[in-house]
């Protein structure tokens, strides 16, 4: 049966026993800046082109054991959430991956900047259709990272990022705080903000909307046919990247402002229990859970 | 995210260093009174001192970026400091990534075309 997260973002017209919008997102390329990925996993084989870009810091600790499946875990899961054959949002989207996070899931602002520059240069060398850039990472507020995101957005690229898993104001983190980036918080099957250990999803006015981000089934790098459940604002951002890819595939000429407006327009409104947020943040945090457009757009979104 | 907000610095630390001296006889000395700023991550454990992104003013060409980076290296060498240019940015932002001692920040902030300098910091999978 359809996983809860795909059901949640799917308009009622499509809630049959399976989620299968044919070829969704096929005109769009989604760039993923994350860990290395297992690109031949059955769920994503042929859908993800691993670029030769790699800029990661060394792993911490003298006894760190580099295990390939662990190194690939985060990125493989997110690639599956965006475009996986069976558990993905935009099953027609093609992806390109850049490695900016090491085997411990750690990267640098500078490595991320160089990755964003790589995408811009690729775009200039070989202009393709609409581009979505997924940044499932967060660091402290960074003027330079926000500036780079702004420049890339002004070049027509749609950037989607994780709000952060710090149960804190997203405005204190980057790239979540960049105004031009679509910043995504995480909700669960009960439309509650996601709790992650002692922390949880970030919130506040720098968040644009929420999306499913708890117990999300996706490709596991443990084996080539394995699936695993993962949680976080990265998973939430991956849903929105997939939805954006489908919207842009249906309407390639959409501007960033129009896309943002559509994402907000089609979101479920006022379903999140705001009591989870600090009192002073409730009015500032958008009560929106991302969803695909309804069946009136069948000809556009499910062509 | 969330368009329409003002710039939000939060706990972000900003250190403004006024450009007082004109030592080293810079050929393209900055205009009087302009200041380049230094930024670093407010979360101490995430800081990566020793690596800095030197961001140059918007219209700076690649050749000027390279020249500015070389000038920094030359001036640092005269003071007995080793520096390494790790990357020269162009395409999105003009500037360069440099590995150097924090002692050289004041010198770097006085270079021509410099808009601001940011200390590198960590990002994490979410």
């Amino acid at each position: 049966s359809i996983p809860w997260n795909l059901e949640r973002i799917t308009p009622p017209r499509y809630r049959a026993d399976e989620y299968q919008p044919p070829d969704g997102g096929s005109l769009v390329e989604v760039y993923l800046l994350d860990t290395s990925i297992q690109s031949d996993h059955r769920e994503i084989e042929g859908r993800v082109m691993v670029t030769d870009f790699e800029n990661v810091p060394e792993e911490d600790g003298t006894r760190f054991h580099r295990q390939a499946s662990k190194c690939d875990s985060h990125g493989t899961h997110l690639a599956g959430v965006v475009s996986g054959r069976d558990a993905g949002v935009a099953k027609g989207a093609s992806m390109r991956s850049l490695r900016v996070l090491n085997c411990q899931g750690k990267g640098t602002v500078s490595g991320t900047l160089i990755g964003l520059e790589f995408i811009r240069k690729s775009q200039l060398v070989q202009p393709v259709g609409p581009l979505v850039v997924l940044l499932p990472l967060a660091g402290g507020y960074s003027r330079v990272l926000n500036a780079a995101c702004q420049r890339l957005a002004r070049a027509g690229v749609v950037l989607v990022t994780a709000a952060g898993n710090f149960r804190d104001d997203a405005c204190l983190y980057s790239p979540a705080s960049a105004p031009e980036v679509i910043t995504v918080g995480a909700t669960n099957a009960q439309d509650q903000p996601v709790t992650l250990g002692t922390l949880g999803t970030n919130f506040g006015r720098c968040v644009d909307l929420f999306a499913p981000g708890e117990d999300i089934i996706g490709a596991s790098s443990d084996c080539s046919t394995c699936f695993v459940s993962q949680s976080g604002t990265s998973q939430a951002a991956a849903h929105v990247a997939g939805i954006a890819a489908m919207m842009l595939s249906a309407e390639p000429e959409l501007t960033l402002a129009e896309l943002r407006q559509r994402l907000i327009h089609f979101s479920a409104k006022d379903v999140i229990n705001e009591a989870w947020f600090p009192e002073d943040q409730r009015v500032l945090t958008p009560n929106l859970v991302a969803a695909l457009p309804p069946s009136t757009h069948e000809n556009l979104y499910f062509q | 995210g969330a368009m329409g907000q003002e710039d939000e610095d939060g706990d972000y630390e900003e250190l403004v260093l006024a450009l007082r001296s004109e030592e080293d006889g810079l050929a393209e000395a900055p205009e009087h009174g302009t200041t380049a700023t230094f930024h670093r991550c407010a979360k101490d454990p995430w800081r990566l001192p020793g690596t800095y992104v030197v961001v140059l003013k918007e219209e700076t060409h690649l050749s000027q970026s390279e020249r500015t980076a070389r000038r920094l290296q030359a001036q640092a060498a005269r003071r007995g400091y080793l520096t390494k240019i790790l990357h020269v940015f162009h395409g999105l932002l003009p500037g360069f990534l440099v590995k150097m001692s924090g002692d050289l920040l004041e010198l770097a902030l006085k270079l021509p075309h410099v808009d601001y300098i940011e200390e590198d910091s960590s990002v994490f999978a979410q």
């Epitope: 031949d40 084989e45 042929g46 046919t225 | -």
Partner: antibody, heavy 115, light 109 residues
Framework: QVQLVQSGAEVKKPGASVKVSCKAS????????ISWVRQAPGQGLEWMGW????????NYAQKLQGRGTMTTDPSTSTAYMELRSLRSDDTAVYYC????????WGQGTTVTVSS | QSALTQPASVSGSPGQSITISCTGT?????????VSWYQQHPGKAPKLMIY???NRPSGVSNRFSGSKSGNTASLTISGLQAEDEADYYC?????????FGGGTKLTVL
């Protein structure tokens, strides 16, 4: 263009081993593994397993029961399928195909097991 | 796991439409979006005709179409032509492997 080229026909005695090769070209190797499929004379297709060019991982069909080994050599863009302790019912055409999706196939390698 | 169930043979006249069924379980056909169909002419390697239930690879005639309902997938060939005479195999994911149907011999009368 995307191509899978297999090694030539083999005749083996029962109990012997055979190693079939499959050279891939025209695409990014690490984006797909290689599936191995066999077809006995007059019979249908049988999936034998899959091997990764990315990390060498394998996924074998239960029926192989440890008699088969699949490997890859990314430096030569070649995948291999070795079958040991051959029996007469292993007589078949052995195909390699690209990935689990099996969208491109090799020309097939006939393996005859006969005493 | 056992093979998916296909009819041993079907036939049709040129210009007609035929449908080949492929029945599995909720653990294979019913549980995944990844049903493929292959055409195989005698002495030749199989050729992919339909992937992921209903998608056609480039170069495959639009006379070939695929669909799925529950645990049964179907291949429909419209406007039958002589060159369509061949064996047809369905294939599906299972949780850890892949399974083929027994094959259907299509005869164009």
């Amino acid at each position: 263009q995307v191509q899978l080229v297999q090694s030539g026909a083999e005749v083996k005695k029962p109990g012997a081993s055979v190693k079939v090769s499959c050279k891939a070209s025209g695409y990014t190797l690490t984006s797909y593994g290689i599936s191995w499929v066999r077809q006995a004379p007059g019979q249908g297709l049988e999936w034998m397993g899959w091997v990764s060019f990315y990390n060498g991982n394998t996924n074998y069909a239960q029926k192989l029961q440890g008699r088969g080994t699949m490997t890859t050599d990314p430096s030569t863009s070649t995948a291999y399928m070795e079958l040991r302790s051959l029996r007469s019912d292993d007589t078949a055409v052995y195909y390699c195909a690209r990935g689990y999706g099996m969208d491109v196939w090799g020309q097939g390698t006939t393996v005859t097991v006969s005493s | 796991q056992s093979a998916l169930t296909q009819p041993a043979s079907v036939s049709g006249s040129p210009g007609q439409s035929i449908t080949i069924s492929c029945t599995g379980t909720s653990s294979d056909v019913g549980g995944y979006n990844s049903v493929s169909w292959y055409q195989q002419h005698p002495g030749k390697a199989p050729k992919l005709m339909i992937y992921e239930v209903s998608n056609r690879p480039s170069g495959v005639s639009n006379r070939f179409s695929g669909s799925k309902s529950g645990n049964t997938a179907s291949l429909t060939i419209s406007g039958l032509q002589a060159e369509d005479e061949a064996d047809y195999y369905c294939n599906s994911y299972t949780s850890t492997s892949m399974v083929f149907g027994g094959g259907t011999k299509l005869t164009v009368l």
